[in-house]
Interface confidence: low
């Protein structure tokens, strides 16, 4: 009497999450009777997975009628295949006893599971940094399957290489999850600029995912100050301009101070926008002369994102000079900076 | 909940043609193989005629080239055409399905009366 | 063709008796038998199958035994409920074929 084969003719199949997968077995006989079962690993811990015979198997359904007594085809389909669902599968032949007695097992077929990678999560620093610091951007991505992915990360299109990616876990698993780190160096323009993670996978046919991050989440440029002085007028009034620009975020406040006392406080908004994405903003002080005895010590403060305060200060002498002042620019653009403004009254 | 209900029978002339119909609602008819089993008056249980989930059909001999059995996926429903009725044909006729695992049947419809006589 | 063939054809008994039917195949079907349970004026009802098999909601009263050509059906315990016709079935290979049933009575 010929011995009982049975065929498991593939050694692995690979099918997309979400697909059904189809996992072949034939025997060479029916006799002896007993019945096919399938099960997912090898030993005692082996998992039942479908019984042609009896049971309750939902997401199992037989290939061929395996009610049909001259059928040798035990073919299984499983629909809906999770991750969860990869591992080794064997079908086996049993002879009908009590308990059911193991006659002849399959080779197996690996049944490995494609599943997609979730949309990439791009995440920047929790606190805004200047130009010419170096910020870290982080890119994740989970759920996939087989393991073999590429991150890329790009900057304004031009691909970044100060990454550094890891995929978990390091062993075997039924999926996996990517996480990278991008350094990104600021520039003022970076304004309007973007940070891509984009994530190839066997299951994309081609079309990476993306996930991205706008710089001006993470960037501040510190403003530029400049203080001008206009010529006096012929009513012994000087106007002083304060001009704050190349500034991002919006978020602004400028405070003139008289002598160390405030004079007036004012807030940024509704700035139009620089192509840069930067703002600018210009604030005038009117300093009557002829009302001082003394010298007048004008200070223009500007706190910006919560920052230190940023001040240019000048003095105005009151004394005997020319009534017209040509045009005095305080050129600095942090710390102190003090300009004499001479004002005559006669 | 699973349901097979028969209808189409009545009384027929020998010779005469009949066409049963079985809905089946709770199952997908065309995963399982499917039977018509019938019962004369006062006899016992006889099996009639089979198809299986590919199509593949089978008939007792006395049936043979007389009955046809085919179903219509879309409607969920079986059928058996019954030409050049005889009187030995006069039964209850019960649409049957055949379990998943071997074929063994496990629901029956109600039955429908079917009478040849002149 | 198989045929079945079912013994006896009529059996008296009492409520909360123990019964036993039979069935024998002309030739080998493995474990290919099933039992039905039929009432006047009703469809049958499956009760078992693959020789010792209940289908869902049968009453665990019944059981099968047997393989090859010979098998039987048990009801341990009968109840007024339980009298009715009984028929086994082979379903090896077509043509399936059915034993000349069994009438269960009221003694």
């Known amino acids: 009497e010929e011995e009982l084969q049975v065929i498991q003719p593939e050694k692995s199949v690979s099918v997309a999450a979400g697909d059904s997968a189809t996992l072949n077995c034939t025997v060479s006989s029916l006799i002896p009777v007993g019945p096919i079962q399938w099960f997912r690993g090898a030993g005692p811990g082996r998992e039942l997975i479908y019984n042609l015979k009896e049971g309750h198997f939902p997401r199992v359904t037989a290939v061929s009628d395996p009610t049909k007594r001259n059928n040798m085809d035990f073919s299984i389909r499983i629909s809906n295949i999770t991750p969860a669902d990869a591992g080794t599968y064997y079908c086996v032949k049993f002879r009908k006893g009590s308990p059911d007695v193991e006659l002849k097992s399959g080779a197996g077929t690996e049944l490995s599971v494609r599943a997609k990678p979730s949309a990439p999560v791009v995440s920047g620093p929790a606190v805004r940094a200047t130009a010419e610091h170096t910020v870290s951007f982080t890119c994740e991505s989970h759920g996939f399957s087989p393991r073999d992915i590429t991150l890329k990360w790009f900057k304004n299109g031009n691909e970044l290489s100060d990454v550094q990616t890891n995929v978990d876990p390091a062993g075997k698993s039924v999926s996996y999850s990517i996480r990278s780190t991008a350094r990104v160096l600021l520039t003022r323009r970076d304004v309007h600029s973007q940070v891509i993670c984009e994530v190839a996978h066997v299951t994309l046919q081609g079309d990476p995912l993306r996930g991205t991050a706008n710089l001006s989440e993470a960037i501040r440029v510190p403003p530029f100050l400049e203080v001008t002085q206009q010529s006096m007028r012929a009513d012994n009034q000087v106007n002083v301009t304060c001009q704050v620009t190349k500034f991002y975020p919006q978020r602004l406040q400028l405070t003139w101070l008289e002598n160390g006392n405030v004079s007036r406080t004012e807030m940024a908004s509704a700035l139009p926008e620089n192509k840069d994405g930067t703002y600018n903003w210009t604030s005038w002080l009117l300093v009557n002369v002829s009302a001082h005895r003394d010298d007048v010590k004008l200070t223009c403060q500007v706190e910006h994102d919560g920052q230190p305060a940023v001040n240019k200060s000048f003095s105005v002498k009151v004394s005997a000079h020319p009534k017209e002042q040509g045009s005095n620019t305080a050129a600095e653009n942090t710390g102190t900076n003090e300009r004499n403004i001479y004002g005559g009254s006669g | 909940e699973v349901q097979l209900v028969e209808s189409g029978g009545g009384l027929v002339q020998p010779g005469g043609s009949l066409r049963l119909s079985c809905a089946a609602s709770g199952f997908t008819l065309s995963s399982y193989d499917m039977h018509w089993v019938r019962q004369a008056p006062g006899k016992g249980l006889e099996w009639v005629s089979a198809i299986g989930t590919a199509g593949d059909t089978y008939y007792t001999g006395s049936v043979k080239g007389r009955f046809t059995i085919s179903r219509e996926n879309a409607k969920n429903s079986l059928y058996l055409q019954m030409n050049s009725l005889r009187a030995e044909d006069t039964a209850v006729y019960y649409c049957v399905r055949g379990g998943v695992w071997d074929d063994a049947f496990d629901i029956w419809g109600q039955g429908t009366m079917v009478t040849v006589s002149s | 063709d198989i045929q079945m063939t079912q013994s006896p054809s009529s059996l008296s008994a009492s409520v909360g008796d123990r019964v036993t039917i039979t069935c024998r195949a002309s030739q080998g079907i493995n474990n290919y038998a099933a039992w039905f349970q039929q009432k006047p004026g009703k469809a049958p009802k499956s009760l078992i199958y693959?020789?010792?098999s209940l289908h869902s909601g049968v009453p665990s009263k019944f059981s099968g035994s047997g393989s090859g050509t010979d098998f039987t059906l048990t009801i341990s315990s009968l109840q007024p409920e339980d009298f009715a016709t009984y028929y086994c079935q082979q379903y090896v290979s077509y043509p399936y074929t059915f034993g000349q049933g069994t009438k269960l009575e009221i003694k």
């Open positions: 693959t020789a010792s």
